[in-house]
């Protein structure tokens, strides 16, 4: 008789999940020599241990602590780029500006980027059929808790001027319910962080509005100011030109506003 299996609302574990995590770990240590002390088999075992045989709606940050410990990494605290709803451009930016880091440029972020995973209570099986959806099922699922944990730690590590890239094409440029709005903003340390600088990325070619005056940006400024952190905001009117000028700052067209 086939065993009854919980049907969740979200997509199941990404195919080849164990192999992908292990391969990503090895790749990361190959291209980041400073992380070659990491034992990728132990990393996978700790990752697996965080969610295997556990109810996928009952995962805690504590479950991920062994993995967090193994993935401990020092990034320059004044070179952190946060992002919200504009991941691709943020990653393109740190690809060019090699001394800046998004969460996905760290080992743990790189391992889990774009993956889904969950297990089942009391069995060692990975559930490839379905996993809990944050809204429809539960928030304490393996993926959400992982990102909450690593995002909190990443924000806590930041210092001096912290940058955040925000999507100016969305109705809520700053969304209190995003990982940035609900986790990272509240875990920046006022005694270490002097300024949060928002870069609002414009989508439309002819969009010359000052999106730094958007009500949600004003809301972000208010939250940040109340935490005794200064706030500044810049419009990036031409993201394509912005990237090009990061690549080639000596280009004559890069002195004008981007």
């Amino acid at each position: 008789v086939p065993r009854w299996r919980q049907q969740w609302s979200g997509p199941g574990t990404t195919k080849r999940f164990p192999e992908t995590v292990l391969a990503r770990c090895v790749k990361y240590t190959e291209i980041h020599p400073e992380m070659r002390h990491v034992d990728c088999q132990s990393v996978w075992d700790a990752f697996k241990g965080a969610f295997i045989s556990k109810h996928p709606c009952n995962i805690t940050e504590e479950d991920y602590q062994p993995l967090m410990k193994l993935g401990t990494q020092t990034v320059p605290c004044n070179k952190i780029l946060l992002w919200s709803r504009i991941k691709d451009l943020a990653h393109q930016f740190t690809q060019v500006q090699r001394d800046m880091f998004t969460l996905e440029d760290t080992l743990l972020g790189y391992l889990a980027d774009d993956l889904t995973w969950c297990g089942e209570f009391n069995t060692s099986k990975i559930n490839y059929q379905s996993c809990p959806d944050w809204r429809k099922d539960c928030s304490n699922n393996p993926v959400s808790v992982f990102w909450k944990t690593v995002s909190r730690r990443f924000a806590e590590a930041a210092c001096d001027v912290v940058h955040v890239m925000l999507n100016g094409s969305r109705s809520k440029i700053f969304d209190k319910n995003s990982t940035f709005g609900s986790v990272e903003v509240h875990n920046l340390q006022p005694e270490k962080v002097q300024t949060l600088e928002a870069w609002v990325i414009h989508g439309g070619r002819e969009d010359s509005r000052d999106l730094c005056q958007d009500p949600t940006i004003k809301e972000l400024e208010s939250i940040i100011s109340k935490r005794n952190i200064q706030f500044s905001c810049k419009n990036i009117y031409r993201p394509d030109k912005f990237l090009q000028c990061v690549k080639n700052p000596e280009d004559s067209s890069c002195t004008s506003e981007i």
Epitope: T20, C25, E30, P33, H37, C40, Q41
Partner: antibody, heavy 123, light 112 residues
Framework: EVQLQQSGPEVGRPGSSVKISCKAS????????MHWVKQSPGQGLEWIGW????????DYAEKFKKKATLTADTSSSTAYIQLSSLTSEDTATYFC????????????????WGQGTLVTVSS | DIVMTQGALPNPVPSGESASITCQSS???????????LNWYLQRPGQSPQLLIY???TRAAGVSDRFSGSGSGTDFTLTISGVEAEDVGVYYC?????????FGSGTKLEIK
């Protein structure tokens, strides 16, 4: 069996560009970093850069940052190198290469190499 | 960048004798994980390079036990015991401790 099959020889005019390919087989293409190495005629080996085919992220040796562009097509398991603004200095054999994994650790040595593609720059 | 300097061989080497190729790095290649990121390759005439040794002293898969690697943090030796005709070519050392990986200029082995 791991194989890296490179495209055939190319002749490029000074100032033009060439794009050469490296088709991978015998393993999951996105699971490994691909490196490129240059060997000028009768000379030694120079590392150009790497690409992570899964993410498309790249890194280059300083001297090749404006010369080489690495890309990858995951649907065909093929890595590419494009060389721009060709000069006689670019006449060389170009290799793609990959490390071996030894019990979940990258060996740090290029265990698998393509057969090389000779690029000749001539007017 | 780390500079790799290779020594020359007294050429040609008599068949059946041992040959030692030396390589020096401008800084230590010993990683905090205990591994030394020094590789040796052989490039036979008209062929792609072949990995012989990685981590200073570990033979790559399928490589004859006539090849052995040794050394310290900055001074390395590749020893070929009982040189054979198929060993002819150019030997390169390479560091992979940090980016960019750098190669020595190569040491040519010829057989008498």
């Amino acid at each position: 069996e791991v194989q890296l099959q490179q495209s055939g020889p190319e002749v490029g005019r000074p100032g033009s560009s060439v794009k050469i390919s490296c088709k991978a087989s015998g393993y999951i293409f996105t699971d490994y970093i691909m490196h490129w190495v240059k060997q000028s005629p009768g000379q030694g080996l120079e590392w150009i850069g790497w690409i992570d085919p899964e993410y498309g992220s790249t890194d280059y040796a300083e001297k090749f940052k404006k010369k080489a562009t690495l890309t990858a097509d995951t649907s065909s398991s093929t890595a590419y190198i494009q060389l721009s603004s060709l000069t006689s200095e670019d006449t060389a054999t170009y290799f793609c290469a990959r490390v071996a994994i030894i019990t979940t650790v990258a060996s740090g040595g290029f265990a698998y190499w393509g057969q090389g593609t000779l690029v000749t720059v001539s007017s | 960048d780390i500079v790799m300097t290779q020594g020359a061989l007294p050429n040609p080497v008599p068949s059946g004798e041992s040959a030692s190729i030396t390589c020096q790095s401008s800084e230590s290649l010993l990683h905090s994980n205990g591994k030394t990121y020094l590789n040796w390759y052989l490039q036979r005439p008209g062929q792609s390079p072949q990995l012989l040794i990685y981590w200073m002293s570990t033979r790559a898969a399928g490589v004859s036990d006539r090849f052995s690697g040794s050394g310290s943090g900055t001074d390395f030796t590749l020893t070929i015991s009982g040189v054979e005709a198929e060993d002819v070519g150019v030997y390169y050392c390479q560091q992979f401790l940090e980016y960019p990986p750098t190669f020595g200029s190569g040491t040519k082995l010829e057989i008498k």
